[in-house]
């Protein structure tokens, strides 16, 4: 699991690769702060609850965020 609270940032390693939006349990976007100077995106997968850190600068990940927000806006009344 690429997560650690012993460093200032949560993510140790990040991926440029997207995941299937339907496989996502939760997508957390943690803004940059005094503790971590960069935006962090943590995807929690439905299967086994595995957490993955995604690169917010990757175009493929931006496409994923777009797809997720589109899906959410469809669901909300």
């Amino acid at each position: 699991v690429p997560l650690s609270r012993t460093v200032r940032c949560t993510c140790i390693s990040i991926s440029n690769q997207p995941v299937n939006p339907r496989s996502l349990e939760k997508l957390e976007i943690i803004p940059a702060s005094q503790f971590c100077p960069r935006v962090e995106i943590i995807a929690t997968m439905k299967k086994k609850g595995e957490k993955r850190c995604l690169n917010p600068e990757s175009k493929a990940i931006k496409n994923l965020l777009k797809a997720v927000s589109k899906e959410r806006s469809k669901r909300s009344p």
Partner: antibody
Framework: EVQLVQSGAEVKKPGATVKISCKVS????????MHWVRQAPGKGLKWMGW????????TYADDFKGRFTFTLDTSTSTAYMELSSLRSEDTAVYYC????????????WGQGTTVTVSS | DIQMTQSPSSLSASVGDRVTITCKAS??????IAWYQQKPGKAPKLLIH???TLQPGIPSRFSGSGSGRDYTFTISSLQPEDIATYYC?????????FGQGTKLEIK
């Protein structure tokens, strides 16, 4: 040099199954997602979907759900595309293509595998 | 899904001519378009990405432009080796879409 080398041409009967391989070299296999593209004879390119090479999770385009299966063997840096219950309309050239995820376009392609379905 | 309408489907031009191919997206694709060249029996080859960025080793006679929904691919001076089919690809989306292709022939 970055290379994607696909398996050779296949001739199959309707109802059979075919499995195409795409072996990569020249880069770290798990750094980029792998996509599959179909080209029917005399037709254009059609995107089939992708597989996340870190997790092995496949995602299929709507027209390619059901009979298509994308898998990996990370130990040999190889991606596979399996197609079952073959029909004559599956006759096509199938390409694997590396997705440069940071910018998200396909930068390197395999040479293509011709699948012919004929009774 | 985003549709990409590519035109013309075929065109005939002479060596030295300026050739233009267009792709129109069904919605704004934010310049995320790539152009590929495919010769018979070969895999597509990336020429341009992000509307106008030329891949290393690609001759400068190839160029791209556009924004929003409308994009153009240009060959400033057609060479015999440019005979091929050209495709646009939109990648502003998790669901990738190709244009229908333009078959380029020499007059």
């Amino acid at each position: 040099e970055v290379q994607l080398v696909q398996s050779g041409a296949e001739v199959k009967k309707p109802g059979a199954t075919v499995k195409i391989s795409c072996k990569v070299s020249g880069y770290t296999f798990t750094d980029y997602s792998m996509h599959w593209v179909r080209q029917a004879p005399g037709k254009g390119l059609k995107w089939m979907g992708w597989i996340n090479t870190e997790t092995g999770e496949p995602t299929y385009a709507d027209d390619f759900k059901g009979r298509f299966t994308f898998t990996l063997d990370t130990s040999t840096s190889t991606a596979y595309m399996e197609l079952s219950s073959l029909r004559s309309e599956d006759t096509a050239v199938y390409y694997c293509a590396r997705n440069y995820d940071y910018d998200a376009y396909f930068d390197v392609w395999g040479q293509g595998t011709t699948v012919t379905v004929s009774s | 899904d985003i549709q990409m309408t590519q035109s013309p489907s075929s065109l005939s031009a002479s060596v030295g001519d300026r050739v233009t191919i267009t792709c129109k997206a069904s919605q704004d694709i934010n310049k995320y378009i790539a152009w590929y060249q495919q010769k018979p029996g070969k895999a597509p080859k990336l020429l341009i990405h992000y509307t106008s960025t030329l891949q290393p080793g690609i001759p400068s006679r190839f160029s791209g432009s556009g924004s929003g929904r409308d994009y153009t691919f240009t060959i400033s001076s057609l060479q015999p080796e440019d005979i091929a089919t050209y495709y646009c690809l939109q990648y502003d989306n998790l669901l990738f879409t190709f244009g229908q292709g333009t078959k380029l022939e020499i007059k």
